[in-house]
């Protein structure tokens, strides 16, 4: 399971696509900035085992995929870029799922740290609530796009866990 290399390549591609998706100048959206509280401190202070890292990364990518698969998201972004971005995320999910099977065996379920998974879910709930409150405005989507790019970059500690032998 050569996940570190493939994941990091796909992650870079996803970030490039996300960067290209911008439709309006972010300079006009400063007043819409919002504190989503990505749980970086919880992640930074923790040494993730490989199976833990996989499960948390899977949750982050799954939530991102869900967020950008909504009708509101389709209306906000350029269709071909959105499709490419979603495909990249879908491939990452497949890679992570394949790796889980290889790491812990078909019969076993990966050791999942519920606290971290819950923190990720709550974080995405805050993002969804913000979009709803802002009525899915173009600026709200710009702020969310910037936030997702940031959270992708923040998952460094999780990626370190991918390189660790359990």
């Amino acid at each position: 399971c050569d996940l570190p290399q493939t994941h990091s390549l796909r992650n870079r591609r996803a970030l490039i696509l996300l960067a290209q998706m911008g439709r309006i100048s972010p300079f006009s959206c400063l007043k819409d900035r919002h504190e989503f509280r990505f749980p970086e401190e919880e992640f930074d202070g923790h040494q993730f085992q490989k199976t833990q890292a996989i499960s948390v990364l899977h949750e982050m990518i799954q939530q991102t995929f869900n967020l950008f698969s909504t009708e509101d998201s389709s209306a906000a972004w350029e269709q071909s870029l959105l499709e490419k971005f979603s495909t990249e995320l879908y491939q990452q999910l497949n890679d992570l799922e394949a790796c889980v099977i290889q790491e812990v065996g078909v019969e076993e379920t990966p050791l999942m740290n519920e606290d971290f998974i819950l923190a990720v879910r709550k974080y995405f709930q805050r993002i969804t609530l913000y979009l709803m409150e802002k009525k899915y405005s173009p600026c709200a989507w710009e702020v969310v796009r910037a936030e997702i790019m940031r959270s992708f970059s923040f998952s460094t500690n999780l990626k370190k866990g991918l390189r660790r032998k359990d």
């Epitope: 972010p26 400063l30 710009e142 940031r150 970059s153």
Partner: antibody, heavy 121, light 107 residues
Framework: EVQLVQSGAEVKKPGESLKISCKGS????????IGWVRQMPGKGLEWMGI????????AYSPSFQGQVTISADKSISTAYLQWSSLKASDTAMYYC??????????????WGQGTLVTVSS | DIQMTQSPSSLSASVGDRVTITCRAS??????LNWYQQKPGKAPKLLIY???SLQSGVPSRFSGSGSGTDFTLTISSLQPEDFATYYC?????????FGQGTKVEIK
């Protein structure tokens, strides 16, 4: 360690052109915007403009629009401030500072050391 | 453009004093306000962002409050190294604008 290192002091004559630089290190250069601030001798801070190095999108203060050009070269993590024709009134200290863009994080948390530009005949 | 007005423009105080600087915006800026400290010959240093969040590494004697149009920077017990010029800056919209500065001098 996050650092913004600016080019050295410049002494120019009125009408000359100039390009000063601000090199970022210790962080992802394209993840932050770079703003420029002027401080004339003995005066306060004036915001000039800003650039998003990821796509070179710029915005200027109306007071500086058309007077200066802000640019960036992300391949060398450097932002620039340039003048095509300097005036004596451009004599000032110029600072660059990084900004988190639309992310919720401290604004202008790291600053360059400043570049002193003196324009005199 | 949003105008930022600081008061006072200068003040004299002694070590140990409680110092308060105010900043008023010409229109509501919610909590998008930053405070900076600048010493002669040095670059400005961020003290407070988002009206009341203390920047990492800044002593807890500095605090910020306010929202809408009226904001305050408080130094609970002035230290010798706090004699400097302080600026507020609105961060809600471009062009960003600074207050004219408040110089804190030794009495």
């Amino acid at each position: 360690e996050v650092q913004l290192v600016q080019s050295g002091a410049e002494v120019k004559k009125p009408g000359e052109s100039l390009k000063i630089s601000c090199k970022g290190s210790g962080y992802s250069f394209t993840s932050y915007w770079i703003g420029w601030v002027r401080q004339m001798p003995g005066k306060g801070l004036e915001w000039m403009g800003i650039i998003d190095p990821s796509d070179s999108d710029t915005a200027y203060s109306p007071s500086f629009q058309g007077q200066v050009t802000i640019s960036a070269d992300k391949s060398i993590s450097t932002a620039y401030l340039q003048w095509s024709s300097l005036k004596a009134s451009d004599t000032a200290m110029y600072y660059c500072a990084r900004h988190p863009g639309l992310n919720w994080a401290p604004d202008f948390d790291y600053w360059g050391q400043g570049t002193l530009v003196t324009v005199s005949s | 453009d949003i105008q930022m007005t600081q008061s006072p423009s200068s003040l004299s105080a002694s070590v140990g004093d409680r110092v308060t600087i105010t900043c008023r915006a010409s229109q509501s800026i919610n909590r998008f306000l930053n405070w900076y400290q600048q010493k002669p010959g040095k670059a400005p240093k961020l003290l407070i962002y988002a009206a009341s969040s203390l920047q990492s590494g800044v002593p807890s004697r500095f605090s910020g409050s306010g929202s809408g149009t009226d904001f305050t920077l408080t130094i609970s017990s002035l230290q010798p190294e706090d004699f400097a010029t302080y600026y507020c800056q609105q961060a809600i919209d471009l062009p960003f604008t600074f207050g004219q500065g408040t110089k804190v001098e030794i009495k």
